[in-house]
Interface confidence: low
Amino acid sequence: DTHKSEVAHRFKDLGEEHFKGLVLVAFSQYLQQCPFEEHVKLVNEVTEFAKTCVADESAENCDKSLHTLFGDKLCTVATLRETYGEMADCCAKQEPERNECFLQHKDDNPNLPPLVRPEVDVMCTAFHDNEATFLKKYLYEVARRHPYFYAPELLFFAARYKAAFAECCQAADKAACLLPKLDELRDEGKASSAKQRLKCASLQKFGDRAFKAWAVARLSQKFPKAEFAEVSKLVTDLTKVHTECCHGDLLECADDRADLAKYMCENQDSISSKLKECCDKPLLEKSHCLAEVENDEMPADLPSLAADYVESKDVCKNYAEAKDVFLGMFLYEYARRHPDYSVMLLLRLAKAYEATLEKCCAAADPHECYAKVFDEFQPLVEEPQNLVKQNCELFEQLGEYKFQNALLVRYTKKVPQVSTPTLVEVSRNLGKVGAKCCKLPEAKRMPCAEDYLSVVLNRLCVLHEKTPVSEKVTKCCTESLVNRRPCFSALELDEAYVPKAFNAETFTFHADMCTLSEKEKQVKKQTALVELVKHKPKATKEQLKGVMDNFAAFVEKCCKADDKEACFAEEGPKFVAASQAALA
């Protein structure tokens, strides 16, 4: 359905509050370095313009596309060339090339200072003084640091952020009420950002066929009672929503997401028995709830898959008639029977099945050729099962911090060329899989672990793409989306790597170590550990453990000393010398 004015259409559909929030997010994700006040000014100008179009859709410029309107607005920023360099060249292009150009300049690792949380009283005063500005600042700060954050979901986070302050700034103990809520929002926000980044990478690097396959598998696990046609409809709609959001079309994305939530709630009976409690909630909460809904129970009477996909003489005929539909049905049928498998494993099985049919349907006796295809899935299934088992055992044995350290060593040996901050960030997040997944029952471990690892490894791929340093990382990231994790798992010590020269400065520490939070201390120690492995890639576990134990003892000793800085100055060189000797 075409509208005379797209901007008026979206303003009316979304309402002023959501419209303004989404435009602010869009601008902040594109121009990540611009000051808050500049963005607020631009958003207000766009909003005033939208209102004139609502009043008269035939008014001047109201017929322009949203990309044209928003792009023209972004290109009015006076300091574009000084602040963004070559991104300013985007403004010389016409749509749609201009928007593509802006998208290509989104920075996954912007050079922005870490967000510092002010005192609770300071935050509560700011909240009460100007609630609207306070919440806009939240949207702006999150969006510019996470340029692919799922915009309608960010509005939901902002609503929760507002609710936390509204409740806790009235409480007797404001800090006890507020801080845990803010910690939870921060952690959930980082996780949400990383999950969305994988969806966008899947669409942008591997195409919508890859995303649709992922969605078929995931939705079939969630809605095993739904018919294939119903799942296909949801997949088509979901793909449109995420394509729009990943492409910077945030108003369309939010609007279509609301339509999808409405459709799901109107058709619960043919989708899932678990949707009811979501559908009673207001829009933002409803969409979030539907996205996170637990798997419905599997129908009790599902027949064996073998009849249709192995034993039938019509397999090749059905495959030839509509390859993607037949493979989609196979994936749907397999996924709805296996909530205990990771989505990535299900996609590997579908790929394997496709490869077998491609080969066997050209053979003299196709049926004989593909008769044992399900047996051949076994190694693909066992590989992630064994990986989860081994790593959960290691996690239970070591605890989270030491498990992270084991992964730091493992991944630094695999890809020592990768920057130390990236190795620390990625390995720490890989290590969080233990606490997140290992406590779950057996049937939930693999989907939790492998699909979480896919999200974390995508972060490595995204950061590495910005500054490529390792052919191995490029290969694992680009060859196959579904085999990324097995590809990284298969990497061993990089024998070609020339060890990094020892730099005493890297291992020089000061009294500021003592005032760091526990997490910050861990990051410092883990940074040192990565540097040690880069210096001595063939160091044994025992050698590295010895050095790290010495490090902990050295820091503890100096932090207890009266003159801490003098202690670090005196003990530091001793620690360095002892470490070099231990690793010789």
């Epitope: 590997r348 394997a352 490869a355 077998t356 080969k359 044992k372 295809v373 047996d375 051949e376 190694p379 693909l380 590989e383 290969k475 060859e479 196959s480 085999n483 097995p486 590809c487 798992s489 298969a490 990497l491 061993e492 010590l493 024998e495």
Partner: nanobody, 123 residues
Amino acid sequence: EVQLLESGGGLVQPGGSLRLSCAASGFTLDYYAIGWFRQAPGKEREGVSCIASSGGSTNYADSVKGRFTISRDNSKNTVYLQMNSLKPEDTAVYYCAAAVLECRTVVRGYDYWGQGTQVTVSS
């Protein structure tokens, strides 16, 4: 029963060529990376070449680069190692091995092994 069977070995003069085959039975090679290894008398088994399950990724030991070529024909469930410009130091028993999806850089990373085929380069 899962089996890998090497063939194509033999006696060849320096500068000559051989084509080794690794045929799988009991499972489909589509889902496996295949590595070729060799072991000379009194020496460690060493990696020669490997091809990932997709066929898109191959790697070679420095000592054979430019002389050996690995390829696969999934329709025949077979992987080949074309060996040209053979040298006496290529003399060894050649083994093929399979690992799920991706090449490994260590011997213990492989799940299935063949029995080996002898290659002798001598004048």
